[in-house]
């Protein structure tokens, strides 16, 4: 083993290095001292370090470590943050288009329904947005709400235009009849299935991306323990105390220290791997009715078909509803 | 037969959006994201090594510091922790993760469970017998996964989706991100971190 180079007789070099860390020289001894009060950089002989310097080194070592960790995760963090923003905005755009398509369908095919239909369609797609962003809305309730609201307007405007406006009593009766008589056939159920499946997947996809950001942020801002700070100090700075300014830590030694400091963080590894693989599986399955883009942009067509279905059965329906809601209608016509 | 939202169709049976065809769809963007994420699959296990490679470590020097003394780079003492009496490295590992790390692990377990639940086989998506009682409904054909319309005439097979990402106000390509490669070790760059903190080579 080669003999260590003789320590700087005056600690001059150590002082000039330490000055960068801590302006003001009072902590650095003029000449090497026994260093019996040192707790981390235990000297084998005279040392140019004091207890105060040691504390400053520990602080700096932990700061170094935090910066290294942040720079290590920068690219990953950027990747997830940017994609979460892109997808959130893209999903909002999909919802906006879907709403516009549906409104256009009403305007082109059923102009007499438009003012109210626009309102109900708007509320439905607002609910869709809220759901995607994590609000606790039941998709079946959203779809029922849309059809419950639409049917009275369809009945009074398309099927039975003689009814007076603001027929509140009949509207309530019609809302009830809508479900009891299944006036839209199975279209509401079809829409519920498609919308709930596609939105669930979309929502979990966004949730997963946001959790990814949270994971990186958590590990990015970890505060390292005192023990870790001591190990890092010993590795990066204790050589200075002996005047060995240009010496670097041994590679294997660095790995051992890092494994120790990061033992907790590395425990995330198993779950992180699983997270990426599970997310891949989810993404691979996001097609057809599991793809909100596909489902929402086709909704106008399904809603149109559901109204056609009502019109096709108008004769049968009008008779049944005439009997069912007779009481309400009499009150209206009086 | 119905009017459809004007400027949206070339062919009534296929939803073709009259936007400029961009190469990127949401699904291609999703797949691209997954591919990039997969390059980070070992991120946490590789972290100790990554940090060592990005901090000053003896690479070409004959001598290196082992925490106590100057040793030859390939000697046994180089890898040994030169501070065994001060506190036990094993003890440090035994302490277990910080509470915040435990919390985030719990959240990861939860989302992984949800992701797995959502990623079940996709074959049997819609009930084939959607039409129960009530006024009869049009049939959707065999592949109800794709049945976006409902009754024969108005049924539309939704072909390729809108190319939305063109509309996004910004194009966030991760290739332009700072510090692009996880594997690369730009030795000159990381020195500045240490210079700022007073560490000099």
């Amino acid at each position: 083993q080669p003999p260590p180079p003789p320590p700087d007789a005056t600690c001059h070099q150590v002082r000039s290095f330490f000055q960068r860390l801590q302006p003001g020289l009072k902590w650095v001894p003029e000449t090497p001292v026994p260093g019996s009060d040192l707790q981390v950089c235990l000297p084998k002989g005279p040392t140019c370090c004091s207890r105060k310097m040691e504390e400053k080194y520990q602080l700096t070592a932990r700061l170094n470590m935090e910066q290294l960790l942040q720079s290590a995760s920068m690219e990953l963090k950027f990747l997830i943050i940017q994609n979460a923003a892109v997808f959130q905005e893209a999903f909002e755009i999909v919802v906006r288009h879907a709403k516009n398509y549906t409104n256009a369908m009403f305007k082109n095919n059923y102009p007499s329904l438009t003012p109210q239909a626009f309102e109900f369609v708007g509320e439905f797609f607002t609910d869709v947005s809220l759901y995607i962003l994590g609000s606790d809305i039941n998709v079946d309730d959203m779809v029922n709400e849309l059809f419950d609201s639409l049917f009275p307007v369809i009945y009074t405007q398309l099927m039975n235009p003689g009814l007076p406006d603001s027929a509140l009593d009949i509207n309530e009766c019609l809302r009830g009849a809508r479900r009891d008589l299944k006036v839209f056939g199975n279209f509401p159920k079809l829409i519920m299935t498609q919308v709930s499946k596609s939105l669930q997947v979309t929502r979990i996809f966004l949730q997963a991306l946001n959790l990814g950001i949270e994971v990186i942020n958590t590990t990015d801002h970890l505060k390292f323990s005192k023990d870790c700070g001591r190990m890092l100090t010993r590795m990066w700075y204790c050589s200075y105390c002996q005047g060995l300014m240009m010496v670097k830590p041994c590679g294997g030694y660095c790995n051992v220290v890092m494994q120790g400091c990061m033992a907790g963080v590395v425990e995330i590894d198993k779950y992180w791997r699983e997270y990426i693989l599970s997310l891949e599986e989810l993404v691979n399955g996001m097609y057809r009715i599991y793809d909100m883009e596909n489902v929402l942009l086709g909704l106008f067509s399904t809603i149109h078909d559901s109204i056609q279905y009502v019109q096709k059965n108008a004769g049968k329906l009008t008779t049944t509803i005439g009997k069912l809601c007779a009481h309400s209608q009499q009150r209206q016509y009086r | 037969s119905a009017y459809y939202p004007e400027d949206l169709f070339i062919d009534k049976k296929v939803l073709k959006v009259a936007h400029v065809e961009h190469e990127e769809t949401l699904s291609s963007r999703r797949r691209e994201l997954i591919q990039k994420l997969k390059s980070f699959i070992s991120f946490y296990s590789a972290l100790p090594g990554y940090i060592c490679s990005h901090s000053p470590v003896a690479e070409n020097d004959t001598l290196c510091w082992n925490g106590q003394e100057l040793v030859e780079r390939y000697s046994q003492k180089a890898a040994r922790n030169g501070m065994k009496n001060q506190f036990n490295l094993h003890e440090l590992k035994m302490k277990g993760p910080e509470p915040v790390v435990s919390q985030i692990i719990d959240k990861l377990k939860h989302i992984n469970q949800l992701l797995r639940t959502m990623s079940m086989p996709k074959g049997r998506v819609l009930d084939k017998n959607l039409d129960e009682e009530g006024f009869e409904s049009g049939d959707c054909g065999d592949d109800e996964d794709e049945c976006i319309g409902g009754s024969g005439d108005g049924m539309i097979k939704v072909k390729n989706q809108l190319r939305f990402l063109a509309e996004l106000a910004y194009d966030l390509d991760v290739d332009d991100a700072p510090g692009n490669s996880q594997q690369a070790t730009p030795k000159d760059n990381e020195i500045s971190t240490f210079h700022n903190l007073g560490n000099v080579h």
Epitope: I137, N138, D141 | -
Partner: antibody
Framework: QVQLQESGGGLVQPGRSLRLSCAAS????????MHWVRQAPGKGLEWVSA????????YYADSVKGRFTISRDNSKNTLYLQMNSLRAEDTAVYYC??????????????WGQGTLVTVSS | QSALTQPPSASGSPGQSVTISCTGT?????????VSWYQQYPGKAPKLLIY???LRPSGVPDRFSGSKSGTSASLAITGLQAEDGADYYC??????????FGGGTKVTVLG
């Protein structure tokens, strides 16, 4: 005639339980979200809880979360509020209110007359 | 969840106008969520006056009007009448779909 009628209020000791009911008539009950709103003597309105049309989603104010449970029986056109671990600060007139919409809170277009709950030892 | 902010009182003479403000945050009123207004007489149940920021249910006089901008909403009563003396509450909801009320404004018709 659209109507809501609350019942079940009264004097109760702190820590005890009470169940409020609200009978609905004159509208398609199963088609609308429903709410409980309370008003302490001389104070403003405070929203307590909501339930969507199917009962599939429920919402609570922070002040009652974990202690109160909202539920509905669409076949009986009735809304319920189960109040456990009652505190003095729960003393108020409790109103049952119908929402304009079915999926979640929006605006309350029909209100009951209220039932007084007094929590005191 | 925090309440919306309303002035505690407002007053005006018959025939005059009164405006009541209601200030929320970016997570309720400012988050595209609509505002509703209620009128309440002492000892009575509240009554819906305005919903979706500006719409009036049938039966509500057009002297009452609502508006919304950013995180604030307001209720205007023009041509004030004696029977308009009451408490007025604004209401919205947040992204958790929990309802928030304002603290209430007591309107006094002078003279």
């Amino acid at each position: 005639q659209v109507q809501l009628q609350e019942s079940g209020g009264g004097l109760v000791q702190p820590g005890r339980s009470l169940r409020l009911s609200c009978a609905a008539s004159g509208f398609t009950f199963s088609s609308y979200a429903m709410h409980w709103v309370r008003q302490a003597p001389g104070k403003g309105l405070e929203w307590v809880s909501a339930i969507s049309s199917s009962g599939g989603s429920t919402y609570y104010a922070d002040s009652v979360k974990g202690r109160f449970t909202i539920s509905r029986d669409n076949s009986k056109n009735t809304l319920y509020l189960q109040m456990n671990s009652l505190r003095a600060e729960d003393t108020a007139v409790y109103y049952c209110a119908k929402d304009r919409r079915g999926s979640h809170a929006d605006a309350f277009d029909v209100w009951g007359q209220g039932t007084l709950v007094t929590v005191s030892s | 969840q925090s309440a919306l902010t309303q002035p505690p009182s407002a007053s005006g003479s018959p025939g005059q106008s009164v405006t009541i403000s209601c200030t929320g945050t970016s997570s309720d009123v400012g988050h595209k969520f609509p505002v509703s207004w209620y009128q309440q007489y002492p000892g009575k149940a509240p009554k819906l006056l305005i919903y979706k920021n500006l719409l009036r249910p049938s039966g509500v006089p057009d002297r009452f009007s609502g508006s919304k901008s950013g995180t604030s909403a307001s209720l205007a009563i023009t041509g004030l009448q004696a029977e308009d003396g009451a408490d007025y509450y604004c209401q919205s909801y947040d992204s958790s779909l929990r309802v928030v009320f304002g603290g209430g404004t007591k309107v006094t018709v002078l003279g």
